[in-house]
């Protein structure tokens, strides 16, 4: 029985390493050897890669090696399968090396914040040594917060031929550790490099993001004062690394700001003793860079009708800011 006609020929040019073609079927019932016929140097030269009489007979792959790999170039490839019963030839296929070139991954050597620029990381990497000089490379930068499994991606191209490259990734979360990895490919190629080794960088610290604030109303005391326990924590979405130096609390009866009282604490809970009127309570956290937005709670008057569910009540502040990612060089 004749061998099957080689089909699904796929070729890839590993830059300055080899030009490899594979095809199907990968295995034949009887011992089969293959010839891959190639024209190169824009048709001026021809050669053959063969698996005959080798341990790789029956193996549906063949590689051409330097120095006969020329770039840029167009190759013509035909695969011949041969067994004891005869030869079957594939259709002729055509390959533009620029379109099938695969290069090494770049090497990230630093991921750092830039002093004074908020929510940005500057990624610096070394262009792969084994990449064509003066060619435009396209890149995919993958990044995620260190405690997340979800990668985000940004694509860009670089025309520079300097070996050291930089990219500024903006509108990130403040004071957050990010994991970065980078891959690249010649602009015209369908094959990406592998991913670079991951590198971690941390965005600059900012004033605290905000607080989620709760209160528990306790029964009024004999003297008429009402204990109100305040509790707060970092707002959802705040940077994991964020640390507050302390918290400022101020409160006053409704419509009477003259009676404002203030408290400073380093705890995340505080008990107030309020009169029977309606009160407004405000809490901010602060660090060396400033204060968070204000978290606000209204404490109803004693005689105000409240349901049982109001005994333990939380006020979650939603900051109306958009945290979409925009990226700039």
């Amino acid at each position: 029985v004749l061998p099957a006609k080689p089909e699904n020929i796929s070729c890839i040019f590993y830059y300055e390493e080899n030009f490899t073609c594979t095809w199907s079927p990968e295995k034949e019932a009887s011992y089969t050897w293959y010839k891959v016929k190639r024209t190169y140097s824009y048709g001026y030269k021809s050669d053959i890669c063969s698996t005959d009489n080798s341990t790789r007979g029956n193996h549906a792959s063949c590689s051409f090696l330097p120095p006969t790999i020329t770039n840029p170039d167009n190759y013509t490839i035909q695969v011949e399968a041969q067994n004891a019963d005869g030869i079957m030839k594939s259709d002729i296929t055509y390959w533009n090396l620029d379109a099938i070139m695969k290069i090494e991954p770049p090497e990230i050597f630093s991921v750092k914040s830039v002093l004074g620029i908020k929510r940005m990381l500057q990624i610096k990497w070394i262009r792969p040594v084994l990449a064509p000089h003066s060619s435009t490379l396209k890149y995919t930068l993958r990044f995620r917060t260190i405690n997340s499994a979800y990668w985000m991606e940004v694509n860009f191209t670089k025309e520079d031929i300097d070996r050291d490259e930089t990219y500024n990734l903006t509108e990130l979360q403040a004071f957050t550790e990010y994991v970065m990895t980078l891959r690249c490919a010649p602009a015209e190629s369908m094959f990406w490099s592998g991913w670079s080794q991951e590198k971690v960088g941390t965005t600059e610290e900012e004033a605290p993001y905000g607080l989620d604030l709760w209160r528990v109303l306790k029964p009024a005391m004999v003297d008429g004062r009402r204990p109100v326990q305040l509790m707060w924590k970092k707002a959802t979405g705040a940077p994991v690394l964020e640390k507050a130096l302390g918290y400022n609390i101020w409160y006053f009866p409704e419509n009477n700001t003259n009676l404002t009282e203030t408290v400073n604490t380093t705890n995340q809970t505080h008990e107030l003793y309020l009169g029977g009127k309606t009160y407004w309570v405000y809490v901010v956290s602060y660090n060396s860079l400033g204060e968070s937005p204000v978290a606000t709670l209204r404490i109803p008057a004693l005689n105000e009708k409240t349901g049982l569910n109001d005994i333990f009540e939380a006020q979650k502040i939603e900051w109306h800011e958009h945290h979409h990612h925009h990226h700039h060089h």
Epitope: S41, K45, C49, S50, T55, S63, L65
Partner: antibody, heavy 131, light 108 residues
């Protein structure tokens, strides 16, 4: 037996045209490249043109570029050389030659490599360009 | 184009003596693409050596080739009467393919 038989050589006036044919037998024609090589009377060999196994033109000698065209018809096992705007200096014996894949010494690795070289020549056909 | 210069242009050798022909390229040529042919009187050329040093099928081991870059050599260890003819080097590396001008070998 591998054979290449050229035909079409003739006496032609300057500026005239001629088409040379080379019929191949004894081998699988479409596996091989084909070339035309000429030899002016009492002179050395000059490569004229070639066509690879896939049907792509290998190229032309500078002296004939733009005037000569090589082609092949695999169904007829034939290679052609269309010669236009002929000049006196094109007078020569024109040889048809086969380019075969020959294995070079083991280059290492898992594979064997073959490169194409002229290994079979026809007897030649004489083209004379004269007024 | 790559110019191939052969020296000497003619050679007269006694039977049994060695002979050597040099082929110098005007620019570097890959050893894969350097070939030697012999054209015996009244015949078509025949392939002697391909890839600088590989002997074609049926070629006597008296013939050997060597060289790299721009300098290539064909050696005949012991010349015999059947070796007479014109020897040509040819390069395939750069377009267009070019031959040397030929070296005529005669028997003394």
């Amino acid at each position: 037996e591998v054979q290449l038989v050229e035909s079409g050589g003739d006496l032609v006036k300057p500026g005239g045209s001629l088409r040379l044919s080379c019929v191949a037998s004894g081998f699988t024609f479409d596996d091989y490249g084909m070339s035309w090589v000429r030899q002016a009377p009492g002179k050395g060999l000059q490569w004229v043109s070639g066509i690879n196994w896939a049907g792509g033109t290998i190229g032309y000698a500078d002296a004939v570029k733009g005037r000569f065209t090589i082609s092949r018809d695999n169904a007829r096992n034939t290679v052609y050389l269309q010669m236009n705007s002929l000049r006196a200096e094109d007078t020569a014996v024109y040889y048809c030659a086969r380019e075969s894949p020959l294995r070079l010494g083991d280059l290492g690795g898992d594979y064997f490599y073959y490169y194409y070289y002229i290994d079979v020549w026809g007897q030649g056909t004489l083209v004379t360009v004269s007024s | 184009e790559v110019v191939m210069i052969q020296t000497p242009l003619s050679l007269s050798v006694s039977p049994g003596e060695p002979a050597s022909i040099s082929c110098r390229a005007s620019q570097s040529v890959s050893s894969r693409y350097l070939v030697w042919y012999l054209q015996k009187p009244g015949q078509s050329p025949q392939l002697l050596i391909y890839g600088t040093s590989s002997r074609a099928t049926g070629v006597s081991d008296r013939f050997s080739g060597s060289g790299s870059g721009t300098d290539f050599t064909l050696r005949i260890s012991r010349v015999e009467a059947e070796d007479v003819g014109v020897y040509y080097c040819q390069q395939y590396d750069n377009a267009p393919r070019t031959f040397g001008q030929g070296t005529k070998v005669e028997i003394k």
